[in-house]
């Protein structure tokens, strides 16, 4: 019996997308690269439901985790890695007093019950996101794919 696996092994399915929560740590730019290497993107949050889901994943594991949000292009103007701006209705997710840009903090992370800005060169866990596969169109997607784990072997 063939089973539909909309996401690669070790990825989590939520509302039509697949998410990979890393088990190793990288800086923000290397986290972007790690996601690209597996055909994904450092997570861009598109809805309140998605935010709640991801925040829960991060807080449960008690990890500081990079998301695809920074103000590297222009200080104080937060932009997602897909080029879209941070909308005002999403600014509610910043932790109290954040973003504060203390010491050039230009990249956003999941921290506790909200978001925090931190230095982009710090190594943290990260979350990749890509669209889930549609099992009805392509038979190969009924097969369980080999693990796609964007974690480099230890140096």
């Amino acid at each position: 019996e063939r089973l539909c696996h909309p996401c690669p092994w070790e990825w989590t399915f939520f509302q039509g997308n697949c998410y990979f929560m890393s088990n190793s740590q990288r800086n923000w730019h290397d986290s972007i690269t790690a996601c690209k290497e597996v055909g994904a993107q450092l997570v861009v949050i598109k809805s309140a439901e998605e935010q709640n889901f991801l925040q829960l994943q991060s807080s449960r594991s008690n990890r500081f985790t990079w998301m695809g949000l920074s103000d590297l292009n222009q200080e104080g103007t937060w932009q997602w890695v897909d080029g879209s701006p941070l909308l005002p209705s999403f600014k509610q997710y910043w932790n109290r007093g954040e973003p504060n840009n203390v010491g050039e903090e230009d990249c956003a992370e999941f921290s506790g019950n909200g978001w925090n800005d931190d230095k982009c060169n710090l190594a943290k866990f990260w979350i990749c996101k890509k669209s889930a596969a549609s099992c009805s169109r392509d038979e190969e997607q009924f097969l369980s794919p080999a693990p796609a784990t964007p974690n480099p072997p230890p140096a």
Epitope: K46, S47, A48, E49, G76, T77, P85, P88, S89, K91
Partner: antibody, heavy 119, light 106 residues
């Protein structure tokens, strides 16, 4: 109480630039969560969102009109200005400014100002 | 951009009728939806925000429900003052209005 009032020319010629002002009271655009937006409505048609500015001075524009729009605020005067370049007869509409609660829904609206584009 | 589709475009009803207007989003918007009422020559008036929260001062005969992509505005017992055009609006990704539903006298 919260009030908003739009002002600007009633008639604009094609290719000209439209400048509209929204004067508001009862809240401050420097307060966290406060946003003001411009929305228009051609005669007999639906509402169309144009632009929004928030308490951080971040600006957001309609994808289809962003090359023609500029939104700015003067917090000390409690005023908002929208400029729209290269006006065309299809831009004839009632233009509203409205407060957006935390950048979400529009809880207070001005009465609107009708702008006609004609030569 | 997210598209909002309202149905029906026009609705004929009588005083006392239960009226339901539907709004569909082209992608999931959680509960980030508002409903407005507009009368001719007037600015829109907020009725419902976050899909189901009643704005202060709005009569309790108005209610909203839904989440994700499907939403409804219900008027439990239509009153003479309710004949107007109703718009839904999403605020999950930028801001988009539906095309409107005109509620007219049957």
């Amino acid at each position: 109480q919260v009030t908003l009032r739009e002002s600007g020319p009633a008639l604009v010629k094609p290719t000209q630039t439209l400048t509209l002002t929204c004067t508001f009271s009862g809240f401050s655009l420097s307060t966290g969560g406060m946003c003001v937006s411009w929305i228009r409505q051609p005669p007999g048609k639906a509402l169309e969102w144009l632009a929004l500015i928030d308490w951080d001075d971040d600006k957001y524009y309609s994808t289809s009109l962003k090359t023609r729009l500029t939104i700015s605020k003067d917090t000390s005067k409690n005023q908002l200005v929208l400029t729209m370049t290269n006006m065309d007869p299809v831009d004839t509409a009632t233009y509203y400014c409205a407060r957006a609660h935390s950048g979400s829904y529009f809880d207070f609206w001005g009465q609107g100002t009708l702008v006609t584009v004609s030569s | 951009d997210i598209q909002m589709t309202q149905s029906p475009s026009t609705l004929s009803a009588s005083v006392g009728d239960r009226v339901t207007i539907t709004c569909r989003a082209s992608q999931r918007i959680s509960n980030w939806l508002a409903w407005y009422q507009q009368k001719p020559g007037k600015a829109p008036k907020l009725l419902i925000y976050k899909a189901s929260s009643l704005e202060s001062g709005v009569p309790s005969r108005f209610s909203g429900s839904g989440s994700g992509t499907e939403f409804t505005l219900t008027i439990s017992s239509l009153q003479p003052d309710d004949f107007a055009t109703y718009y839904c609006q999403q605020f999950n990704s930028y801001w988009t209005f539906g095309q409107g539903t005109k509620v007219e006298i049957k």
